[in-house]
Amino acid sequence: AQGKEVVLLDFAAAGGELGWLTHPYGKGWDLMQNIMNDMPIYMYSVCNVMSGDQDNWLRTNWVYRGEAERIFIELKFTVRDCNSFPGGASSCKETFNLYYAESDLDYGTNFQKRLFTKIDTIAPDEITVSSDFEARHVKLNVEERSVGPLTRKGFYLAFQDIGACVALLSVRVYYKKCPELLQGLAHFPETIAGSDAPSLATVAGTCVDHAVVPPGGEEPRMHCAVDGEWLVPIGQCLCQAGYEKVEDACQACSPGFFKFEASESPCLECPEHTLPSPEGATSCECEEGFFRAPQDPASMPCTRPPSAPHYLTAVGMGAKVELRWTPPQDSGGREDIVYSVTCEQCWPESGECGPCEASVRYSEPPHGLTRTSVTVSDLEPHMNYTFTVEARNGVSGLVTSRSFRTASVSINQTEPPKVRLEGRSTTSLSVSWSIPPPQQSRVWKYEVTYRKKGDSNSYNVRRTEGFSVTLDDLAPDTTYLVQVQALTQEGQGAGSKVHEFQTLSPEGSGNLAV
């Protein structure tokens, strides 16, 4: 922003009525009147170029400083060319000196040169030669100087002539202010420019109505430079929640719009599934049946709990069940769907039912599932199981109703036995197996089927009540295919994998261990 000038003294505007002091009195500087454009103009002039040593002073009236710290002095003047005088006037000069003196009171006509401090020698850029003067075409020079810091109540300026032909047409003394400013929704007051050129005066701004400094943001500050210019803005204000920036002010959000925090963004239209908001709204309330989770941004549509998983199947595999489902048809407008699986078991004989979380094993924790399948194992044969799969999202906790689907399955078969080779010799294989403890009581016997690898025409069967068997009378260094199956009162359980076990070759017959 451009600096503002506050004038303390304006000779040209005073119409010759300032009554400046000349020294020596009646010699040297003289107030003259001229007509220009039918208007009287006043000037102080001096032209003692032929008279040798000159020391003519012109002192302004006492000027009250007020709040100025640095003053600017603008001079408009003409200087005649020394060569335009007869003989070149050996004592003729083409410059004059500018002085100032500070004081707390007006000395009146008491003029003392020693109190004055030289500001500068003022030299013209252009001198007025004879031909210009005769054609009444004078060359006007403009020079500006500044002085500061000033500390007393007022000051004088003085002009010393040392033998020039000078006409002083304008003396304007002013100081500069940084003007009142609205920037970044902050108001900065009119501020007096500082006196030191390198330093900048720091000025705190105040936020306009309904604007605030954002959390963690810097307070608005600007720097007022010596020339009255605002520089280096720091920090800013933002329109508070419920208000948006319109030009240099904060205006309340229109009905149907909202703004949930202090930010540069405009008010946003209320999202889907919300009620129309009043003026100046910071959020929009949800429609009946729709909700906003605590972590949901106000800009997100209101959502609702999902519908139940769309399709649920329970596939029995021995003593395991694989549960599979598809996502709800209605996600409630959210993507944070998770599933929870619960289990109930019922004894067919008594019809008695109860939870079975403690006795079954899930392939992964059954709550907060993101996948759409889970395997449940360690199920007991001849038991009825009901599995419930519930779909939940971020707003499910805000309602009491639940969205779930159930599937029932009867376990009729035992889990396949896990078979191990415990030992071997040239003519025997010692085989053991295991099944989950809950199923063991249901098993009547185990059937071990074995045959030579490559001989698919004949096979042998052994039955046992235990969990191991030694198969004898086998050929050395021969691979046998072995399978174990549980037999229950109701029939066959699931068969194990077909395993390949090899007897020792005769040269390794000393070793019975695996």
Epitope: M317, P416, L421, R424, L429, K453, G454, S456, T479, L481, Q483, A494, G495, S496, K497, V498, H499, E500, F501, Q502, T503, L504, V514
Partner: antibody
Framework: QVQLQQWGAGLLKPSETLSLTCAVY????????WSWIRQPPGKGLEWIGE??????????NYNPSLKSRVTISVDTSKNQFSLKLSSVTAADTAVYYC?????????????????????WGQGTMVTVAS | SYVLTQPPSVSVAPGQTARITCGGN??????VHWYQQKPGQAPVLVVY???DRPSGIPEQFSGSNSGNTATLTISRVEAGDEADYYC???????????FGGGTKLTVL
Amino acid sequence: QVQLQQWGAGLLKPSETLSLTCAVYGGSFSDYYWSWIRQPPGKGLEWIGEINHRGSINYNNYNPSLKSRVTISVDTSKNQFSLKLSSVTAADTAVYYCAKPLRPHCTNGVCYSGDAFDIWGQGTMVTVAS
Amino acid sequence: SYVLTQPPSVSVAPGQTARITCGGNNIGSMNVHWYQQKPGQAPVLVVYDDSDRPSGIPEQFSGSNSGNTATLTISRVEAGDEADYYCQVWDHSSDHVVFGGGTKLTVL
């Protein structure tokens, strides 16, 4: 880490014999059954056969549909095994792969016939055209 | 000879779960292995012995096998999972390796 590098003629005329070799780098050559598998363009995988060399004996096993034309042999000094397929026709046009099973064939009496193939050669495209 | 039956194609949206089946008589008594094959590349083993994963294969690949059906499950499917998938068993009656016909997985 075992690596398989395979090579052989890529363009044959009908009735010629296809010949491919697979070199095994790293690992114990005699502990595994080494297989050849092929894949006609745009079709699925077909197992051709396998070989294992233990002691001084080669144990071979071939896909019945190719058995009459296939020979798989080994050169234990170079840790290489080879495939020969005679009397080729356009139907034998395929990418041919050599492959290593995940586990040694038998360990402490537990054997793994038809084990999963965990390492494959880079494949050789063989085209049969007159 | 033993036959493994796979669906020719399966399509699934990103982030969803893909299930590829492999049917065979009493396949539950056999160890089933699964391979992924991308165009122009050799197959890569992703699951062996029904449900075990080789090192370096992500948890999203899992398998199960019971009765007459083995299943490869790929959870949280990504575009990079688009490939052909093959199942494989050893037929103990004929002593031969058998591959399924393959399933093309398309990620929508």
